[in-house]
Amino acid sequence: VPRWRQQWSGPGTTKRFPETVLARCVKYTEIHPEMRHVDCQSVWDAFKGAFISKHPCNITEEDYQPLMKLGTQTVPCNKILLWSRIKDLAHQFTQVQRDMFTLEDTLLGYLADDLTWCGEFNTSKINYQSCPDWRKDCSNNPVSVFWKTVSRRFAEAACDVVHVMLNGSRSKIFDKNSTFGSVEVHNLQPEKVQTLEAWVIHGGREDSRDLCQDPTIKELESIISKRNIQFSCKNIYRPDKFLQCVKNPEDSSCTSEI
């Protein structure tokens, strides 16, 4: 008799999830000498332990503490790049500007990037059929709690000038409900962080508007200023040229506005 299984609104666990996490861990620790001491089997066991046999709507930050401990990593606190709704460009940027880091450039972020996972209460099975959707089902699901935990910690790590890349093509350039807007903004430490500098990335070739004047950016400025952190904003009119100039800063065309 087939067992009744909870049907959630979101996609199920990414296929080959255990193998993917383990392979990513091995690859990361091979590339990053400072993380060579990490035992990837222990990392997978801790990851699995955070959600297996637990109700996927009842996950807590504490469930991820063993994984967080194993994934401890010192990040240069003045080289942090946050992003919202523009992950690909942020990652392209840190691939070129190797001394800067997004969360996905850390071990924990790298392990989980673009993956979905959940278990079932009282069984050791991984649910590959469906997982809770943040809006339709519950917010305390394994994926959301993981990203909330590591994002909070990443923001707390930041110091000096923190950069954030924002998508100028979206109706809400700054979205209070994004991970950046709901978690990272509120966990920057005013005693350590002097300035948050927003880079607003333009989508259209002929878009010459000053998107730093957008009402949602003004809202971000207000939130940041109230937290006693300075705010600055730059328009990135040509993201393609921006990346090119990061690669080749001596290029004569890179002196003009990007």
Partner: nanobody, 124 residues
């Protein structure tokens, strides 16, 4: 609950070496769960990170102070210390020892726990 307490002279002469100690209670200084550091706040200025030390013994120092700073740990006394050589009036500040939880991504600047601070004045 982890508690930190700074101790050391409140007055140091220019060109001399400043030496401060931080006593840790409520946790072991050699535990891999924590990392330790020093920060300071000159009068009317922002906090400044001086340096940190990890359970492995490795250290990170603020590049602008690196040539003058040493941070070390005494596990037998559950203490860690700061020495800052060749001090000038610009080193006058409230000095804080700090601790950080080692989990997830962390910065060099520990900020989960902090002592009450001790004022050090550099003057002849």
């Amino acid at each position: 609950q982890l508690q930190l307490q700074e101790s050391g002279p409140g007055l140091v002469k220019p060109s001399e070496t400043l030496a401060l100690t931080c006593n840790v209670s409520g946790g072991s200084i050699s535990s891999s769960s924590y990392y330790w550091g020093w920060i300071r706040q000159p009068p009317g200025k922002r906090l400044e990170w001086i340096g940190s030390i990890y359970h492995t013994g490795s250290t990170h120092y603020n590049p602008s102070l690196k040539s003058r700073v040493t941070i070390s740990v005494d596990t037998s006394k559950n203490q860690f210390s700061l020495t800052l050589s060749s001090v000038t009036a610009a080193d006058t500040a409230v000095y804080y020892c700090a601790g950080g939880d080692r989990y997830g991504p962390v910065g060099q600047w520990p900020s989960d726990y902090r002592g009450q601070g001790t004022l050090v004045t550099v003057s002849s």
